[in-house]
Interface confidence: medium
């Protein structure tokens, strides 16, 4: 009931709580002397459902039969209307429409850890829309029954707050949940289980790893578990991997030897536990242990390449380059590289440890036969040395690969192709494709890149350290024993017209012709490999088309003669540069007047 109901009553039959689809009778009746003054026949009783008028009647009472009420709560209010006055609230009632509880389904219980508490969950079924009380009962050995009630609106979980003990792990427990509301009750099917069925061990803790004699092959994982644990499963993986290695162990008693770990690798380890071979469930995975395995001496051999540069009649510069070992080959932190240089006939040798670099440059006599050996060392030892005999890599003309071409292949890739050398192609033991950014000064500090290709290959895709709009000098070497032949080409992965033209820095007169000198276009403005320069000239103040001379681009060329100018005529000259994508804008303009005699 709502409000004070001083003036009258609202009664509901059969009940304030009804089953969905039922009919209710609502009666509103006035108490004595609570009607309208003067004429009681003027009493007009009105029944509202929420704010909507559903019935009215003149007199002291009103009866209304109501059907089709929705699930939930519906409010009915009775009001009195008298002539020349506002409606007066008499009384009201709430009617609760719902359903009897369905049978709770899938009752299951779990105890987290040997010291945890028993908690059960179930599925309530459809909402009753009424206050429904759930009672969970657990019957166990020694004729004991625990009972807990739940007063939440949506109750599907209860924790007894008690701890089952493993005195008789095979003893049976039976759980049952009963739902009760005003319209009925329903009990779940009983769920019968043993201690071993429902206890889910706590995850293992205090995980440690030990490497005996700092060796990856003698590794033991240790952990702590609850007392009754029989089974463990271990999973481990390199930290950068998504795939786990799994191991199942029985009666491990908190330790297990791992035999297949890789050296110098960070691993993640986790462990889970179970109390019984067939019964119960696995614990959650433990917190991860992350640990790095010890180093082992490097395997594999360094990939070594070199460059020779003529200094003078008696000396040459040797630059050695090598690539880092892969992580799996290095098997540790490379502390230094050992380079040994030896003159093969005289037996003179020098050894040097290089740290922090993967290159080494020295000057040696041009005479004698020289060899180098390079190896990588970590804390456990050194890799096998890579030995190379220093030779003139381009000396054997007949070994030079033919028809070398370089074409752009997608973003930041260049496809290099060639034909085998004229000399017996079967003599080739391997090809080496080398590339470096083209710098007009032939700068030896520019990083060198290379890859090796099998003797039956006639193409290679180069992608390492390739940038768009940069020109690369590409060489293909054919190696055969202690001989080598090479061919070179320029190539770029992406090009466009140069951003500027060459800057003319001088024009000089020589025997009736002129020599034009210019500064190279800065590398970052070349926008790829230059193919040609163009020199333009025309008479000053003339509207005629300029004449031009096109010069094939050569890296070292910075001047060119022109002999078709008329004496004592002032000319304007400028230059442009071209890539395969087009021509640059003009460089600077210079005026010049040839002083020589007229013909």
């Amino acid at each position: 009931k709502i409000d004070a109901c001083k003036r009258g009553d609202v009664t509901v039959k059969p009940s304030h709580v009804i089953l969905l689809g039922s009919t209710v009778n609502i009666t509103c009746s006035l108490k004595p002397r609570q009607g309208c003054f003067h004429y009681s026949r003027r009493n007009k009783l009105i029944l509202y459902k929420f704010d909507r008028r559903i019935n009215f009647h003149h007199g002291h009472s009103l009866n209304s039969q109501v059907t089709g009420l929705p699930l939930g709560t519906t409010l009915f209010v009775c009001k009195l209307a008298c002539i020349n006055s506002d409606e007066i609230q008499i009384c009201g009632a709430e009617i609760f429409v719902g359903v009897a509880p369905e049978q709770p389904q899938n009752l299951s219980c779990i105890q987290k850890g040997e010291q945890g508490t028993v908690a059960c969950t179930w599925e309530r079924g459809r909402d009753t829309h009424l206050y429904t009380e759930y009672t969970l009962q657990l019957s166990g050995p020694k004729n004991l029954t625990w009972q807990k009630q739940c007063k939440d609106i949506y109750c599907d979980y209860l924790d007894f707050g008690i701890n089952l003990t493993p005195e008789s792990p095979e003893s049976n427990f039976t759980a049952k949940v009963t739902a009760v509301n005003s319209l009925g009750s329903s009990s779940s099917l009983p769920s019968t289980f043993t201690f071993l069925d429902i206890v889910r061990p706590l995850p293992p803790w205090d995980i440690r790893i030990k490497f005996q004699k700092a060796s990856v092959s003698r590794c033991t994982l240790y952990w702590r578990d609850e007392g009754l644990v029989l089974l463990n499963r271990l999973r481990y993986r390199p930290s950068n991997s998504r795939l786990w290695n799994m191991v199942n162990v029985t009666k491990a008693k908190g330790r297990h030897d791992l035999l297949d770990l890789k050296p110098f690798t960070e691993y993640e380890f986790q462990i889970s536990s179970k109390l019984h071979l067939y019964k119960g469930s696995w614990s959650d995975w433990s917190e991860s242990l992350r640990a790095q395995t010890p180093e082992e001496e490097p395997t594999g051999m360094l990939d070594v390449w070199y460059m020779k540069r003529h200094i003078d009649y008696s000396r040459q510069q040797i630059s050695l380059f090598w690539k880092n070992l892969s992580v799996s080959e290095a098997r540790g932190k490379i502390l230094h590289y050992q380079v040994t240089l030896q003159e093969l006939t005289g037996g003179k040798a020098m050894t040097q440890n290089i740290t922090g670099h993967t290159s080494w440059t020295t000057v040696i006599p041009r005479t004698g036969n020289w060899a180098v050996a390079v190896s990588a060392a970590n804390s456990k030892g050194s890799s096998l040395p890579t030995r190379i005999n220093i030779m003139n890599l381009c000396e054997a003309g007949l070994l030079a690969p033919r028809q070398v071409s370089a074409n752009s292949e997608g973003m930041d890739n260049i496809l290099v192709t060639w034909q085998p050398p004229r000399k017996d192609p079967s003599a080739v033991q391997e090809y080496v494709v080398e590339w470096r950014e083209l710098h007009p000064g032939g700068d030896t500090q520019v990083p060198l890149n290379w890859l090796r290709s099998r003797p039956y290959n006639v193409s290679a895709l180069i992608s390492e350290n390739i940038k768009s709009y940069i020109c690369y000098e590409i060489r293909v070497y054919a190696l055969s024993g202690d001989q080598g032949g090479c061919s070179s080409i320029l190539g770029n992965s992406k090009h466009k017209a140069p951003l500027s033209g060459p800057h003319i820095n001088a024009i000089t007169e020589e025997k009736g012709s002129i020599l034009i000198s210019w500064n190279s276009i800065p590398v970052q403005e070349q926008m790829g490999c230059l193919l040609h320069y163009r020199i333009y000239w025309k008479e000053r103040d003339s509207n005629s088309q300029p004449q031009l001379c096109e010069i094939p681009y050569r890296v070292s060329q910075n001047s060119h003669p022109i002999n078709s100018l008329q004496p004592r005529v002032t000319y304007v000259l400028w230059m442009t540069a071209l890539t395969a994508a087009g021509e640059s804008s003009h460089g600077n303009e210079r005026e010049f007047c040839l002083q020589g005699k007229a013909n």
Epitope: W146, Q147, K151, I162, N163
Partner: nanobody
Framework: EVQLVESGGGLVQAGGSLKLSCAAS????????MGWFRQAPGKEREFVAA????????VYVDSVKGRFTVSRDNAKNTVYLQMNSLKPEDAAVYYC??????????????????????WGQGTQVTVSS
């Protein structure tokens, strides 16, 4: 130190009812599980019923289930045992006990004497046939 005093025992006919009370003092009552045990002459002390700290979990021995109801009033520091349909075999000295507090690593079923730290002096219940 918790002191427990039982009351409400007496002589009753078979089929009758009694309500035992146990008043606690000297501790934080709401932090203890409370239990009832009984001991008949010449027999071991036997667990009867218990109620957990919050009052919504109860446990009964099967022989009294449906006849006895354990309840508590934390505001009054009192635990009750309502005994209906009493039988001659229910006759015994009834003891009230306060269980040791739950910690993160210690839970209990509260059905064994060793789960309880404090005990009352007992109250006699006699059932005549």
């Amino acid at each position: 130190e918790v002191q427990l005093v039982e009351s409400g025992g007496g002589l009753v006919q078979a089929g009758g009812s009694l309500k035992l009370s146990c008043a606690a003092s000297g501790g934080t009552f709401s932090s203890y599980a409370m239990g009832w045990f009984r001991q008949a002459p010449g027999k071991e002390r036997e667990f009867v019923a218990a109620i957990m700290r919050s009052g919504d979990t109860t446990v009964y021995v099967d022989s009294v289930k449906g006849r006895f109801t354990v309840s508590r009033d934390n505001a009054k520091n009192t635990v009750y045992l309502q005994m209906n349909s009493l039988k001659p075999e229910d006759a015994a000295v009834y003891y009230c006990a306060a269980g040791r507090p739950v910690t993160r690593t210690y839970y209990s079923t509260y059905t064994y004497p060793h789960d309880y730290d404090y005990w009352g002096q007992g109250t006699q219940v006699t059932v005549s046939s």
